[in-house]
């Protein structure tokens, strides 16, 4: 399979920090027009999940094999399908990532489902925000199935897909009826082209038996390994924080692969990195579990410990997936050759030993470089080993050097030397630098020169208003990135300080020197004027306005429109949160009402001068009801309606709307348009036999008018013909053009 990984950073509290990165481990990937073939492509795929247009996303290439997509401005930008395409020629491969809104009405229990041909796939949408409406399932954007809202089981709507075939693959969604599509649960179903454990054109070949959650590719029989595993059968774990087919890539940032979703070529799909799980990949594996999405169980034997990234870590003397295979046993077990601690910490050091006779607590000691001997404070005795725990006094720099763990029993002695490095936490030597400032945010370069030891694992930025006694606000940032302090007060001085940390307990250094940074916020001075407006319906008004042309950038965050209904003494406000907007659609207004209208520019919480007011009259509501509605059954499936036009019409009728409902039925009514308003009769077809129906209708001019009286009529029984002039009803039918 092509070595192509799509990483999604799931720090969802701030869409502006969200990014997608596509990384290729292929030789020469992405170099463009030279001999290495086409570049990596990373894009949002709007064919199935469409989101409102926003500012264009920014694509940045980092070297020849990495491309990153940024520039998401609001959470809805993130919802949908993203794809990365890499590899050359026949190896050109598309990797797909599906992003769900964490605030959606429905959330997928599991986004990616990889199943074998002929299996049953079960998609489960969990109710997050309940609505008492039906749930529509779609496949690749097209209607697929409806579930009544009562059919939820244990807070979940399930879609069972029996005997799936490869054409069933694609994007599935579950949406409450009449809810925003952005609130849907989106799923990706991948159907392998063969049954379980098989691959090849006729599915005749046997898969190699992929380990650690790897998935056998149905075309070439290779294992697509989960992130964090390598080898032809995914038998080998990468070091923590590494991924790629040869473990050659490293997770960005200070928390390793936490918060990252990894998407790999089909049929693997997407998962968290090794050691992480949860909808946002922010939860570490529970004890005893490891691997991508923590799907694997350790079941270590003989004192093996479960590492959530690699599985069983065996003590000396044992090996195998579950540490079930015996070695020759040395007496000191599992002693690291080098340990690192931070200055002034009081670490615990463990030393494990086995032997015959069995070591007890007093028989294991720890010797410092200056010759001081420490006795263990606690020992854990297990059938196959004793682990002595040593509480080390507060470390000083002189404690750096070679330490020794020694075990002595009547059966002899063993010792193991290991190196201890005592590191000094970093302290900034300078204040952070202000890069840019706005009314509500400051962009700061946090990484400064420092004393002490690296590497820098965490940068904390502490800030609060100048002269304030309130608590410092703290933001933890990636050492390599500039940081934006958001939601600040306009025109306010902030004291900003940096604190650096290095890895390990006690790695936090002292705070650096403070600096004063001040936010901006000029008052908006421009007075808009109302260019015009037009009525888009009896309750809808489209308003447009202009601003004077002045040099330089526009000072403003958006516009405040006010509508005053003097008759009722009521005001309506509309916020337009874009300073570029010059038009707005006001809906839900009262037909036949005089409104006074004005518009103001705002910046932060400051308002500019209001425009001169305008006076708008909305037209009254729609036409009166049609008269003398009558229903007559024609057959077991047809009923003819006749009526008279409404009186005193304010204008020409554009259409009639007929409402059809089964009498006593609980379902939603059906609405049928009669698009030829000169008609005074129509035939409703496709009805059920021997069934009582209710009908009513209304006319539309600019808006929908009042309903007519309701009439009741039953279709005839099966096999019975309607009495009356069948020829006339047919002629009427032809003239209706339904």
């Amino acid at each position: 399979a092509v070595d192509l990984t799509l990483l999604a950073n799931l720090r969802l509290t701030d869409p502006q920090r969200f990014f997608l990165t596509c990384v290729s481990g292929e030789a020469g990937a992405g170099r463009g027009s030279d001999a290495w073939g086409p570049p990596l492509l990373l894009e949002k795929d709007d064919r199935i999940v469409r989101t409102p247009p926003g500012p264009p996303l920014r694509l940045a290439r980092n070297g020849s094999h990495q491309v990153t997509l940024r520039g998401f401005s609001k959470p809805s930008d993130l919802v949908g399908v993203f794809s990365c395409v890499g590899g050359a020629g026949a190896r050109r491969t598309r990797v797909i990532y599906v992003h769900n809104s964490p605030g959606a009405h429905l959330l997928p229990d599991k986004v990616t489902h990889t199943v074998n041909k002929g299996d049953t796939a079960v998609l489960s949408a969990r109710v997050h925000k309940e609505k008492q409406t039906d749930v529509i399932w779609k496949s690749n954007g097209s209607y697929f199935y409806t579930l009544d809202w009562h059919e939820a089981q244990d807070g979940r709507f399930l879609l069972q897909l029996p005997n799936v075939q490869p054409p069933s693959s694609g994007i599935y969604s579950a949406t409450y009826l009449e809810a925003s599509p952005l609130g849907s649960a989106f799923f990706r179903l991948i159907v392998r082209g063969c049954g379980a454990g098989r691959w090849g054109p006729g599915c005749t070949k046997e898969c190699p038996g992929c380990l650690h959650g790897g998935v056998c590719h149905d075309h070439d029989g290779e294992c697509v390994c989960p992130p964090g595993f390598t080898g032809t059968r995914c038998e080998q774990a990468c070091r923590e924080g590494r991924f790629g087919q040869s473990c050659q890539e490293q997770c960005p940032g200070i928390s390793g692969c936490r918060g990252l979703t990894f998407c790999l070529p089909d049929p693997y799909g997407c998962s968290c990195g090794s050691g992480w799980r949860g909808s946002q990949c922010q939860e570490a594996c529970a004890p005893g579990h490891f691997g991508a999405d923590c799907r694997l169980q350790c079941q270590c034997q003989n004192g093996g410990t479960c590492d959530r990234f690699s599985g069983c870590v065996c003590p000396s003397g044992w090996h195998g997936v579950h540490c079930e295979k015996s070695d020759r046993i040395p007496q000191i077990l599992n002693m690291a050759s080098e340990l690192e601690f931070n200055l002034e910490t009081m670490p615990r050091i463990n030393c494990a030993a086995a032997g015959n006779p069995f070591p007890v607590r007093g028989s294991i000691e720890l010797r410092k470089p200056d010759g001081t001997v420490l006795l263990s404070t606690k020992a854990i005795v297990e059938p196959e080993k004793t682990t002595a725990e040593f509480e080390v006094p507060r470390l000083v720099l002189a404690d750096s050097g070679f330490w020794e763990c020694r075990v002595s029993t009547s059966g002899g002695q063993d010792s193991r030397r290991f190196k201890v490095n005592v590191k000094v936490p970093p302290v900034p030597l300078a204040a952070p630098r202000l890069l840019t400032k706005q009314s509500r945010q400051l962009v700061v370069s946090p990484l400064v020169s420092f004393s002490g030891d690296g590497p820098i694992s965490t940068v904390r930025l502490h800030y609060r208003p100048q002269d304030s006694t309130m608590d410092w606000s703290t933001i933890v940032v990636d050492p390599s990135e500039n940081v934006t302090l958001m939601n600040l007060r306009p025109k306010t001085g902030y004291s900003v300080r940096v604190q650096l940390s290095r890895p390990g307990e006690g790695g936090e250094g002292a705070w650096g020197p403070p600096t004063l940074m001040t936010t901006d916020c000029p008052e908006p001075l421009l007075q808009p004027w109302l260019e015009g407006w037009h009525v888009e319906g009896t309750d809808r008004l489209r308003v447009s306005w202009s601003l004077p042309l002045v040099p330089g950038p526009l000072v403003g965050d958006g516009f405040l429109l006010r509508l005053w209904d003097g008759t009722r003494g009521q005001e309506r406000r509309e916020n337009v949160s874009s300073p570029q907007a010059r038009t707005a659609l006001l809906t839900g207004l009262t037909p036949g009402t005089h409104y006074q209208l004005d518009v103001q520019l705002y910046h932060c919480t400051l308002l500019g001068p209001a425009s001169p007011p305008a006076h708008v009259l909305l037209p009254p509501s729609g036409p009166p009801a049609p008269r003398h509605l009558h229903a007559q059954a024609l057959s077991d499936s047809e009923i003819q309606l006749t009526w008279k036009h409404p009186e005193a019409l304010p204008g020409p009728i554009s259409k009639y709307v007929v409402e059809v409902q089964v009498a006593g039925g609980a379902g939603d009514p059906l609405w049928i348009d009669v698009d030829r308003p000169e008609e005074t009769s129509t035939i409703i077809r496709g009805l059920n036999a021997s069934t009582r129906y209710l009908f009513r209708m209304r006319a539309s001019i600019q808006g929908l008018g009042d309903w007519s009286n309701t009439v009741e009529e039953s279709t005839l029984g099966n096999g019975l013909q309607a009495e009356g002039p069948v020829q006339e009803s047919r002629a009427a039918e032809e003239g209706l053009d339904q």
Epitope: L560, W564, G569, N575, G588, D598, Q600
Partner: antibody
Framework: EVQLLESGGGLVQPGGSLRLSCAAS????????MSWVRQAPGKGLEWVSY????????YYADSVKGRFTISRDNSKNTLYLQMNSLRAEDTAVYYC???????????WGQGTTVTVSS | DIQMTQSPLSLPVTPGEPASISCRSS???????????LDWYLQKPGQSPQLLIY???NRASGVPDRFSGSGSGTDFTLKISRVEAEDVGVYYC????????FGQGTKVEIK
């Protein structure tokens, strides 16, 4: 710094009148809508009246309609509430409040006390 | 008119612990422009009310980030992640979609 300072409260008999003032400073008064909100002793907040930046449209809670009049003098940066036909149930602390684009009552004054009693 | 209902009406709290106040409106406060027209105010003892949260979930200037607003439509919540002694007072929700209407208030006091 935005400041709102109410004055004019006091003790008045039922049926009497009182005029409250709110002096504004630290912002361009003529750009902002203004409101009066009151709080009866030991009770919650009740919106009373509202006025446009231009002094144009005004509106009132049903409980004071026809008895209270809100007005403003943008040249003096001052908001007024003329209260006539006062009743015992009008006894409250009266606050003036400035709106902004996002909130009706973004900034509040310290309040002035009106007591209606015989 | 839109009616606002808060719960609980009294909330004893422990400093350092989280606290949560609920507010329900008799009709949806979600406007077609995507904003929820609901504000939260705090009135500390002997002081004027102050704006905490506007448009459902936006912290007003100078409000500590331990305060957060959430919810949409008719159900809203004000959360304090770690209560401090200075947070005592009466908290009001208010709908601003129509004629302004306040909730009854929730009195927060230290246990």
């Amino acid at each position: 710094e935005v400041q709102l300072l109410e004055s004019g409260g006091g003790l008045v008999q039922p049926g009497g009148s009182l005029r409250l003032s709110c002096a504004a400073s630290g912002f361009t008064f003529s750009h902002y809508d203004m409101s009066w909100v009151r709080q009866a002793p030991g009770k919650g907040l009740e919106w009373v009246s509202y006025i446009y930046p231009s002094g144009g449209p005004t509106y009132y809670a049903d409980s004071v309609k026809g008895r209270f009049t809100i007005s403003r003098d943008n040249s003096k940066n001052t908001l007024y509430l003329q209260m006539n036909s006062l009743r015992a149930e009008d006894t409250a602390v009266y606050y003036c409040a400035r709106g902004d684009w996002a909130s009706r009552f973004a900034t509040w004054g310290q309040g002035t006390t009106v007591t209606v009693s015989s | 008119d839109i009616q606002m209902t808060q719960s609980p009406l009294s909330l004893p709290v422990t400093p350092g612990e989280p606290a949560s106040i609920s507010c329900r409106s008799s009709q949806s406060l979600l406007h077609s422009n995507g904003y929820n027209y609901l504000d939260w105010y705090l009135q500390k003892p002997g002081q004027s009310p102050q704006l905490l949260i506007y448009l459902g979930s936006n912290r007003a200037s100078g409000v500590p980030d331990r305060f957060s607003g959430s919810g949409s439509g008719t159900d809203f919540t004000l959360k304090i992640s770690r209560v401090e002694a200075e947070d005592v007072g009466v908290y009001y929700c208010m709908q601003a979609l129509q004629t302004p209407q306040f909730g009854q208030g929730t009195k927060v006091e230290i246990k």
